[in-house]
Interface confidence: medium
Amino acid sequence: SGTTNTVAAYNLTWKSTNFKTILEWEPKPVNQVYTVQISTKSGDWKSKCFYTTDTECDLTDEIVKDVKQTYLARVFSYPAGNVESTGSAGEPLYENSPEFTPYLETNLGQPTIQSFEQVGTKVNVTVEDERTLVRRNNTFLSLRDVFGKDLIYTLYYWKSSSSGKKTAKTNTNEFLIDVDKGENYCFSVQAVIPSRTVNRKSTDSPVECMGQEKGEFREI
């Protein structure tokens, strides 16, 4: 039940990449508005996105305070223009979200190959340490700052002239691989958190190939 023309939100869904975290829901409001609340299991409810006609709410500022906590959100529905009005039980209609643990569930953003450098038959490939929205002491922390050794990268590399891929792994942001002299190679990387059960891998980075601007080559 509830006040006339007010319906509860449904399909509450967390959308999160590199800790940028948005709660989405349905339906598009007709003569109603929403307010979102977020809490940890043991904490108090904090209200966000007051009386909005949007069907999404950016909760990043709350979840980055402690990315290892488990969060729960709820979306309240109010009649437009009469937000004091409540349902028959004396409170507005609301719907709970699924639980969300940012550290375990945020999607890993698409990585970027920062540079590669060839020295003889070795190539050093460096992955950009992407910035997250986790802020500490006046700076935004990088993915490596937050995940530490839980985060690894997988490098896929192949000769430009063939399609046979090789792989390498690192728990830093750098790879050092052996290549054949005189051959050009292409590279793509993927971020991985092996210990996770969901959202374990990012999408692959854009492909970068030797002989293009990004690399640096020194024959020694």
Epitope: K65, R136, V146
Partner: antibody, heavy 121, light 106 residues
Framework: EVQLVESGGGLVQPGGSLRLSCAAS????????MSWVRQAPGKGLEWVGF??????????EYAASVKGRFTISRDNSKNSLYLQMNTLRTEDTAVYYC????????????WGQGTLVTVSS | DIQMTQSPSSLSASVGDRVTITCQAS??????LNWYQHKPGKGPKLLIY???TLQTGVPSRFSGSGSGTDFTFTVSNLQPEDIATYYC????????FGQGTKLEIK
């Protein structure tokens, strides 16, 4: 195995200078924030300052008590952290520790054994 | 800089006791407060971060609470191995340790 080894401590007169070093091994040095923490005789821990990692541009922050007198730097090619201490005061007398800092939860997860700095005339 | 006032500076308790240490910040630090345990000859060890989150592997007899400017650290069922000096550390704006609390067993 992660290791941090400080050196460079000793006796110095008030107004003098000293440079401490911390040799790091067992981890990818450029990926970590590094900090100095000190402990005066019979007193508690005091954070001195830190230098951020490569992703954060190796920027520095200092406690108010040392700002303008102390400078933290790092030589990544040598896996070394430094603390340049100028205009030293008697209250700077302490054991100085270098520590690896995990910023997301402000955890000093590895510590050196410390080096004693005595400022006295 | 933010100042942290920790009390008491020392306390003595018996095995099995419940002990409480408090820390007060000179300004609102949200919940950005940690508790460290420091034993002689060892590096300080993080027990609790973000006021109340237990670090992995830390026994559940350690707990923390608070927000804003007032924080509490509790050891329930005190054990002999808990003899140490305990420090709070704020990390809302730079880093500041409390003065420390030396915990002894009666």
């Amino acid at each position: 195995e992660v290791q941090l080894v400080e050196s460079g401590g000793g006796l110095v007169q008030p107004g003098g200078s000293l440079r401490l070093s911390c040799a790091a091994s067992g981890f990818t040095f450029t990926e970590y924030h590094m900090s100095w923490v000190r402990q005066a005789p019979g007193k508690g821990l005091e954070w001195v300052g830190f230098i951020r990692n490569r992703a954060q541009g190796y920027t520095t922050e200092y406690a108010a008590s040392v700002k303008g007198r102390f400078t933290i730097s790092r030589d990544n090619s040598k896996n070394s952290l430094y603390l340049q201490m100028n205009t030293l005061r008697t209250e700077d007398t302490a054991v100085y520790y270098c520590a690896r800092l995990t910023m997301v939860v402000a955890e000093f997860d590895y510590w050196g054994q410390g080096t004693l700095v005595t400022v006295s005339s | 800089d933010i100042q942290m006032t920790q009390s008491p500076s020392s306390l003595s308790a018996s095995v099995g006791d419940r002990v409480t240490i408090t820390c007060q910040a000179s300004q609102d630090i949200n919940k950005y407060l940690n508790w460290y345990q420091h034993k002689p000859g060892k590096g300080p060890k993080l027990l609790i971060y973000y006021t109340s989150t237990l670090q992995t592997g830390v026994p559940s007899r350690f707990s923390g609470s608070g927000s804003g400017t007032d924080f509490t650290f509790t050891v329930s069922n005190l054990q002999p191995e808990d003899i140490a000096t305990y420090y709070c550390l704020q990390y809302d704006n730079l880093l500041t340790f409390g003065q420390g609390t030396k915990l002894e067993i009666k």
